[in-house]
């Protein structure tokens, strides 16, 4: 097969660092899966570079990635999800670097959504709820969630809570009164599938009641 780079191009190419990372998202668009790869060095000259995946596919031996700006991706139903695939950076027919990867070990879930916080006056607590598209999925159903919250004025003092459900109760006495809080949540595969944290959900902001002077409790 043709498509070879000029010799000089290849010599230059071999001086570069073509290390890359990838993540998969299963059933991200109906029954379609996606695979996204990018170079770890943002300054790599990606002109004439392509990504190709071979093995552990249905119907075809290899697939070419689509390039969008500086990321490369595939969206397809045709991942076998059993065994390892070989993902290569190519110039024409020449492979510059390759990785053998099981796509079930690089799963990045979709970000949780519909995060909200409701104050229960009688119970003196806050009920945090959120949703995840993974409840409806066939493959990556079981997730660990990381709820992070902070007082808005505390730039980097996040408190993290790990949970497997989509509901969390925060006790009022654990929070500062009359304060504005920011809360967000992300997810990671927790059963069979392995991988990475999702993106964070959009943040939700809520205010704690002031202290009721007579009882010492918050209003």
């Amino acid at each position: 097969e043709s498509g070879y780079a000029q010799n000089g191009d290849l010599e230059d190419a071999e001086l570069d660092d073509y290390s890359f990372s990838c993540y998969s998202q299963l059933e991200v668009n109906g029954s379609q899966h996606s695979l996204t790869c990018a170079f770890e060095d943002p300054d790599v000259n990606t002109t004439n570079l392509e990504f190709e995946i071979c093995g552990a596919l249905v119907e075809v031996k290899c697939l070419n990635f689509r390039k969008l700006q500086e990321i490369y991706f595939i969206e397809t139903k045709k991942f076998l999800l059993i065994g390892k695939s070989n993902i290569c950076v190519k110039v024409g027919e020449k492979s510059l670097t390759c990785k053998k990867i099981d796509l079930t070990t690089i799963v990045k879930p979709e970000a949780p959504f519909d995060l909200s916080v409701i104050y229960r006056e009688g119970a003196n607590d806050f009920v945090v709820t959120f949703n995840t598209s993974h409840l409806q999925k066939k493959y990556v159903k079981v997730l660990m969630h990381d709820v992070a919250y902070r007082q808005e004025k505390d730039e980097n003092k996040w408190t993290h809570v790990n949970l497997s459900s989509t509901k969390l109760t925060l006790l009022q006495r654990k929070l500062q009164p009359a304060a504005m809080y920011e809360i967000k949540v992300r997810s990671i595969p927790d059963h069979y599938f392995k991988g990475f944290w999702s993106e964070w959900s959009p943040s939700y902001y809520f205010r704690t009641p002031e202290i009721n002077n007579s009882s010492g409790e918050m209003d």
Epitope: E1, V58, E59, V60, F65, G92
Partner: antibody, heavy 122, light 107 residues
């Protein structure tokens, strides 16, 4: 609607050259792998060449490798096949064809041109 | 390279008959198989891909099946417009390859 129109066929002597063109419309050429497929008179279909959506990868069977070159000009909505060192056995109707699926490389073809006849004879 | 063996090369049948065409590959193509119909002087038309997925607009009397190295195109009740030549094609790997064709003629 999707259209593929081949041109450039004709009579050429053995050892000669010919350049086929395929003008496409009704879809974004840069999204698709494209292929040339030929059919000798009274014979079956034979795959001749494929070019990736980006144009960076080209594929050929042994029967034409080194003699034929596939290329594309997405800006001109055109696919080409440069045929050199032509032989009598290259005589065929040449079709350009578009895969059903965009990107990636699933090479089954839902749109075909009407074909252009190439005759190699002295 | 993957070899394609299509059979029969021709067959005679009547309107209403059930027709079966087979395609055997020299190695597992993991359902990377398509079927086409071609009429004289015309370009081929895609009927089936992924071994068993009917292309949009193709009548439901056509069906594809198979896995591994053995694949079948079935016409459940042959219609007058179905008399044509049929080709299988593997797209699992390069070089892409077509079967030799099956000409379906009127008995």
């Amino acid at each position: 609607q999707v259209q593929l129109v081949e041109s450039g066929g004709g009579l050429v002597k053995p050892g000669g050259s010919l350049r086929l063109s395929c003008a496409v419309s009704g879809f974004t050429l840069s999204d698709y792998y494209m292929a040339w497929i030929r059919q000798a008179p009274g014979k079956g279909l034979e795959w001749v060449s494929t070019i990736s959506a980006s144009g960076l990868r080209t594929y050929y069977p042994d029967s034409v490798k080194g003699r034929f070159t596939i290329s594309r000009d997405n800006a001109k909505n055109s696919l080409y096949l440069q045929m050199n060192s032509l032989r009598a056995e290259d005589t065929a109707v040449y079709y350009c064809a578009r895969p059903l699926s965009a990107h990636y490389g699933f090479n089954y073809f839902d749109y075909w041109g009407q074909g252009t006849l190439v005759t190699v004879s002295s | 390279d993957i070899q394609m063996t299509q059979s029969p090369s021709s067959l005679s049948a009547s309107v209403g008959d059930r027709v079966t065409i087979t395609c055997r590959t020299s190695e597992d193509i993991y359902q990377g198989l398509a079927w086409y119909q071609q009429k004289p002087g015309k370009a081929p038309k895609l009927l089936v891909y992924s071994a068993n997925t009917l292309h949009i607009g193709v009548p439901s009397r056509f069906s594809g099946s198979g896995s591994g190295t053995d694949y079948t195109l079935t016409i459940s009740s042959l219609q007058p417009e179905d008399f044509a030549t049929y080709y299988c094609q593997q797209y699992y790997d390069y070089p892409l390859a077509f079967g030799g064709g099956t000409k379906v003629e009127i008995k």
